[in-house]
Structure formats: structure tokens, C-alpha cells
């Protein structure tokens, strides 16, 4: 089937980085500057994305792949292919319409992005608080109060803190 298709459609032989040029008897021509084709058999090349302004070039465009952008420091990428830049906050803060605001008591954020999340409730797992939470860090749960009675075995290692979620992409 592949051989038959090649005989019927000479364009299928054009590799990535070229296009099938109808103006030149369907021969494979290289993509012009600032354009690319990431797959074979294409009849046109796509225009390269330009990373302008606060969008910085992370990867230059080549004849076979589009440019990739990221955001100027102080902001981070959001959306497919870094279609948006969203501002960073400090740890212990979350982003709101009013800008970066401190996490409310009882919540934390250990990243520069995302939302403040409630501290782990150690008592739900029958454990005690070993290290208090802060705006930047979750509480650390220790052994249950019963484990701390005299003669009890050595302290069990704290349960790993739940990984905070990320802002929507």
C-alpha cells in the first residue's frame, strides 16, 4: 500500500523540513526561512511562532520544529505551548484578581504558583502534629498520641506531606 500511495502521490516522499511544491512539479522544496514542517508529505510549511515581548525564546524554530517560548522571569507559562504568561507569587501566597495575597491561617503554598491549600489534619489519621504548619509549609504529622506513652517504641517517621496541586493549565 505504501508503494502504491507513493506512486500515486509524489508528495508523500517529501520529508519533514520540506514541502511538496505544486509550482515546481510537486518536487520537495525546503521550507523557506521562518517556517517549518514537522511531518512528511506536507503541501505547505507552517509559519514559525515568534516569541515577542515578555515571551522569550526557549527553543529556536528549525525547518522541522516550531519555536518554543517561555515567560520573562517573574511570570510563568500557562496553557498549551505557553500561550499565556501568569505572574509568580512568593511561597506562602496565592494569585488573586487583586494580585498576590498571603495564604489565610491554616493554609499554605510551597510554590510560586497555584493556590493555598489547607494544612493536613493529622488527627484524621490518628496522628499528632509534630511540626506546626506555616504559610509556606504543611504541618508534619508525627506518631499518634498513644505511641508517645512511656515505654513506647521509637518515633515513627512522619508521613509525607501531601503534594499540593498546581494551578490549572
Amino acid at each position: 500500500f505504501e508503494r502504491t500511495r507513493s506512486l500515486q502521490d509524489p508528495c508523500s516522499n517529501c520529508p519533514a523540513g520540506t514541502f511538496c511544491d505544486n509550482n515546481r512539479n510537486q518536487i520537495c522544496s525546503p521550507c523557506p526561512p521562518n517556517s517549518f514542517s514537522s511531518a512528511g508529505g506536507q503541501r505547505t510549511c507552517d509559519i514559525c511562532r515568534q516569541c515577542k515581548g515578555v515571551f522569550r525564546t526557549r527553543k529556536e524554530c528549525s525547518s522541522t520544529s516550531n519555536a518554543e517560548c517561555d515567560c520573562t522571569p517573574g511570570f510563568h507559562c500557562l496553557g498549551a505551548g505557553c500561550s499565556m504568561c501568569e505572574q509568580d507569587c512568593k511561597q506562602g501566597q496565592e494569585l488573586t484578581k487583586k494580585g498576590c495575597k498571603d495564604c489565610c491561617f491554616g493554609t499554605f503554598n510551597d510554590q510560586k504558583r497555584g493556590i493555598c491549600r489547607p494544612w493536613t489534619n493529622c488527627s484524621l489519621d490518628g496522628k499528632s502534629v509534630l511540626v506546626n504548619g506555616t504559610k509556606e509549609r504543611d504541618v508534619v504529622c508525627g506518631p499518634s498520641p498513644a505511641d508517645l506513652s512511656p515505654g513506647a517504641s521509637s518515633v515513627t517517621p512522619p508521613a509525607p506531606a501531601r503534594e499540593p496541586g498546581h494551578s490549572p493549565q
Epitope: 496553557g79 500561550s83 504568561c85 501568569e86
Partner: nanobody, 123 residues
Framework: EVQLVESGGGLVQPGGSLRLSCVAS????????MNWARQAPGKELEWVAN????????YYVDSVEGRFTISRDNANNSLYLQMNSLRAEDTAVYYC????????????????WGLGTTVTVSS
């Protein structure tokens, strides 16, 4: 083509005023939150202010609250930043930026940015 073009930057003395403008084209301006952000020399990009679609909600970074005023004119596809009582630390490139679809609900990402206008506050 979707585009934002800033103007109005320049050299001003401390305590002076300046009004920045941003003209939008290629999209329905009145359906988007709009923002100003700035980048001072050697510093990270910083959000400055935003305004909702009809201008009824406006928010500012603490450092400019009471000195800067953001406004918009949907009939003329224009965004403004009135800057009063300017200080040396306000020296920066100021960018106009469009809030992406869903801005304020699911994210605060800005998808279209101008190339900036330079404000220098110096005596």
C-alpha cells in the same frame, strides 16, 4: 492580527505625572480583562494593575496603589494608566497585556502583550 501597542512613555521628574495609552486591535476588546505590567532594569517582570471588562473592578499592586489609576475606553479599544507622584523606582518598561479567556475564573494568564513603552523617572 491581534495586537496591543503602548505609547506615552518618556522622561519625567520625580513627583511628576505621565499617562500611558494602549490601543488594541484584532479582537473584541470589551470582552477581556486588561492589565498593565512593568519590568524595571535588572528586575523581574511585575504585574501593576488590572481592570475588568466594563471598568467596574480595578486592582493595583501595593506599591502603586493611590498613585496610579487604570481605566479603559471600550468604544475606542483603549487602555490607560495615569501615573502620578512618580518615583525613581517606577522607572521601567511598561507593558499592556490582555487577560486570556477565563482570566479571573480559572487563571490569571495574559495571552497577548504589547512590546512596551519606557518610563524613566529622574531629575
Amino acid at each position: 492580527e491581534v495586537q496591543l501597542v503602548e505609547s506615552g512613555g518618556g522622561l519625567v521628574q520625580p513627583g511628576g505625572s505621565l499617562r500611558l495609552s494602549c490601543v488594541a486591535s484584532g479582537f473584541t476588546f470589551s470582552t477581556h480583562w486588561m492589565n498593565w505590567a512593568r519590568q524595571a532594569p535588572g528586575k523581574e517582570l511585575e504585574w501593576v494593575a488590572n481592570i475588568n471588562q466594563d471598568g467596574s473592578e480595578k486592582y493595583y499592586v501595593d506599591s502603586v496603589e493611590g498613585r496610579f489609576t487604570i481605566s479603559r475606553d471600550n468604544a475606542n479599544n483603549s487602555l490607560y494608566l495615569q501615573m502620578n507622584s512618580l518615583r525613581a523606582e517606577d522607572t521601567a518598561v511598561y507593558y499592556c497585556a490582555r487577560g486570556g479567556v477565563g482570566y479571573g475564573d480559572s487563571h490569571f494568564g495574559m495571552d497577548v502583550w504589547g512590546l512596551g513603552t519606557t518610563v524613566t523617572v529622574s531629575s
